[in-house]
């Protein structure tokens, strides 16, 4: 099984124990590590952070001790913006320039492939996204030669039904991608006005349309029905939780909220907590399991957080094995307890390790 793990370059800027550099990563934990994100400037793939080249080197030296590890560079992301991707993909010359710039950049910096993180193609971009993938793969095939393995090509795709329908020609893009990471998280957010788990495995008992689509099981099944081969589908598992501020004394699933949860001490983003911050939060909190959805949530005061723990990730891994998927994807290594100092287990990357162990179990 593949265990595809994202690392985010901006995690270096978190304070104190939250700061994560690629040399803190475990070279034997994942089969693939994806560095997020690269930029595109003047139609050429480019660095984003001032010290990306140094960080690329840090990441890729992990392969010196584990030659089986593959590293990919992810281009795009939320801050890149869909419009910029759209302009490049829809123009034949811009697209060719971008595609031609990728292999030299990846080779120079020691990456084994490219991950496309166009979040998200619009309805008009659907065909252009397919063309971009098809032409990128053709370039990778042509560029490969003896002593120079073919570069890998993957894409991170939304798990939302509406986005899947408007953005992706699943059957066509699947032909050209080496694997597809389906982002089976962020199904529920503060915009809903109520509490809810952002990455449930199954549909909730109360879920009516459109909520009946907002779960991992539906998204995976839908992708498979649309023609994604199970052998290329990698299922996303988050090492972060989504939090809410409760608006009343109700604390269950579906309780009213006044907005996102308070920012974490290190991640500093309202409504999001890294797993290592959740471990802190759990001291003195009340933990519940959403039985049908097979995921936990915790409450403390007026704060509510839905997250994944070692038990829920094992359930998810069992599920993806039952569906004969290619493996699991983790967003993100730097949100797990990468130092092993927060979650009281004396174990670095406890969630990702639980996923790895479950994948290896017979």
């Amino acid at each position: 099984y593949k265990l595809v793990c994202y690392y985010t370059s901006w995690s270096q800027y978190r304070e104190g124990d939250g700061s994560c550099f690629p040399d803190a990563l475990d070279r034997f934990l994942c089969t693939h590590i994806i560095y997020s994100f690269a930029n595109i400037s003047n139609d050429h793939i480019d660095t984003w952070e001032w010290n990306d080249v140094t960080l690329y080197g840090m990441l890729n030296t992990l392969k010196n001790r584990n030659p089986n590890l593959k590293t990919l560079l992810s281009v795009g992301g939320w801050n890149f913006g869909s419009q910029r991707f759209s302009k490049i993909a829809s123009n034949t010359q811009s697209r060719r320039t971008f595609i031609k710039s990728v292999p030299p950049f990846l080779r120079t910096h020691g990456f084994d492939g490219l991950d496309l993180a166009w979040l998200y193609p619009g309805r008009r971009d659907k065909q252009h996204f397919t063309t971009l993938i098809k032409e990128m793969k053709a370039e990778f095939i042509k560029e490969a030669q003896p002593g120079k393995k073919q570069l890998l090509l993957s894409a991170a795709l939304s798990a939302g039904k509406v986005t899947i329908d408007s953005s992706y020609d699943i059957a066509k893009i699947s032909q050209h991608l080496d694997f597809i990471s389906i982002m089976t998280y962020d199904f529920h957010g503060a915009w809903r006005g109520t509490t809810g788990h952002h990455s449930p495995l199954f549909r909730g008992q109360e879920d009516a349309s459109p909520d009946r689509f907002s779960n991992t099981d539906y998204a995976v099944g839908y992708m498979l029905r649309l023609g994604a081969p199970a052998s290329k589908l990698v299922m996303g598992i988050p090492t972060f939780g989504r939090s809410f501020t409760l608006a009343s004394s109700e604390t269950g699933v579906g309780a009213p909220i006044s907005g996102p949860g308070i920012p974490g001490r290190f991640t500093k983003e309202a409504g999001t907590l890294a797993y290592y911050e959740i471990c802190d939060f759990l001291r003195g909190a009340t933990v519940h399991r959403i039985l049908g959805q097979q995921v936990p949530y915790a409450t403390k005061g007026n704060q509510w957080v839905g997250y994944d723990d070692q038990e829920s990730v094992k359930s998810k891994v069992q599920y993806l094995k039952d569906r004969q998927l290619a493996g699991a994807m983790v967003w993100a290594l730097d949100l797990d307890d990468f130092q092993g100092s927060f979650c009281g287990q004396d174990l670095r990357f406890p969630l990702t390790n639980a996923i790895k162990d479950a994948l290896a179990a017979t």
């Epitope: 080197g57 890729n60 392969k63 010196n64 030659p67 031609k100 292999p103 030299p104 950049f105 080779r107 120079t108 910096h109 020691g110 042509k142 560029e143 490969a144 030669q145 003896p146 002593g147 120079k148 393995k149």
Partner: antibody, heavy 118, light 111 residues
Framework: EVQLVESGGGLVQPGGSLRLSCAAS????????MTWVRQTPGKGLQWVST????????FYADSVKGRFTISRDNSKNMVYLHMNSLRAEDTAIYYC???????????WGQGTLVTVSS | NFMLTQPHSVSESPGKTVTISCTRS????????VQWYQQRPDSAPTTVIY?????PSGVPDRFSGAIDSSANSASLTISGLQTEDEADYYC?????????FGTGTKVTVLG
């Protein structure tokens, strides 16, 4: 500035052995495949062997398979060509070349002459 | 293995244009990139064209590459021929298991 310097050439009898070395500088060595190409005096170029950046995949021309071994030491920025069971037809200038990020070899050494003769 | 066949020699006066062909014996010329190397006497080869049509920095735009899929051949064109262009030129391509050089073409600048 990328520099490749070959050494180890010389006169050897048929059936003998030789080890060529290529010292690389000015590049992130483990990121690039490295190649040996030879040229018989007055004749054309012939690919001999290529090794991937991490050294896990060697490739050989049919004419040298089983006799030549390519290897690399990424900690020393060195690539080697171990040549056994040498034949008269192996006489050539041997060039070390860096695999480009594109499909050509973008830097070459000045070559080292190997003469196989009794 | 496939072969790449080039004309043995071509000659032309300074300022004129020469085109060297490189025909692939089996497999499609378009399925793998073609490179062109220039080798002056007593020197190592240098790349003048890579990936069919691309020129490395420092190579004058008098050098251009092309692919003719119907003839299953690649070509190198040198326009505005200069005395320093006198050299041997080799095309090169590859498949999944080996690299192949062309037979080589000697370009002579007359006069």
């Amino acid at each position: 500035e990328v520099q490749l310097v070959e050494s180890g050439g010389g006169l050897v009898q048929p059936g003998g052995s030789l080890r060529l070395s290529c010292a690389a500088s000015g590049l992130t060595f483990p990121n690039f495949a490295m190649t040996w190409v030879r040229q018989t005096p007055g004749k054309g170029l012939q690919w001999v062997s290529t090794i991937s950046g991490r050294g896990d995949e060697p490739f050989y021309a049919d004419s040298v398979k089983g006799r030549f071994t390519i290897s690399r030491d990424n900690s020393k920025n060195m690539v080697y060509l171990h040549m056994n069971s040498l034949r008269a037809e192996d006489t050539a200038i041997y060039y070390c070349a860096k695999g480009g990020h594109f499909s050509s070899w973008d830097y070459w050494g000045q070559g080292t002459l190997v003469t196989v003769s009794s | 293995n496939f072969m790449l066949t080039q004309p043995h020699s071509v000659s032309e006066s300074p300022g004129k244009t020469v085109t060297i062909s490189c025909t692939r014996s089996s497999g499609s010329i378009a399925s793998n990139y073609v490179q062109w190397y220039q080798q002056r006497p007593d020197s190592a080869p240098t790349t003048v064209i890579y990936e069919d049509i691309e020129r490395p920095s420092g190579v004058p735009d008098r050098f251009s590459g092309a692919i003719d899929s119907s003839a299953n051949s690649a070509s190198l064109t040198i326009s505005g021929l200069q005395t320093e262009d006198e050299a041997d030129y080799y095309c090169q391509s590859y498949d999944s298991s080996s690299y192949v050089f062309g037979t080589g073409t000697k370009v002579t600048v007359l006069g």
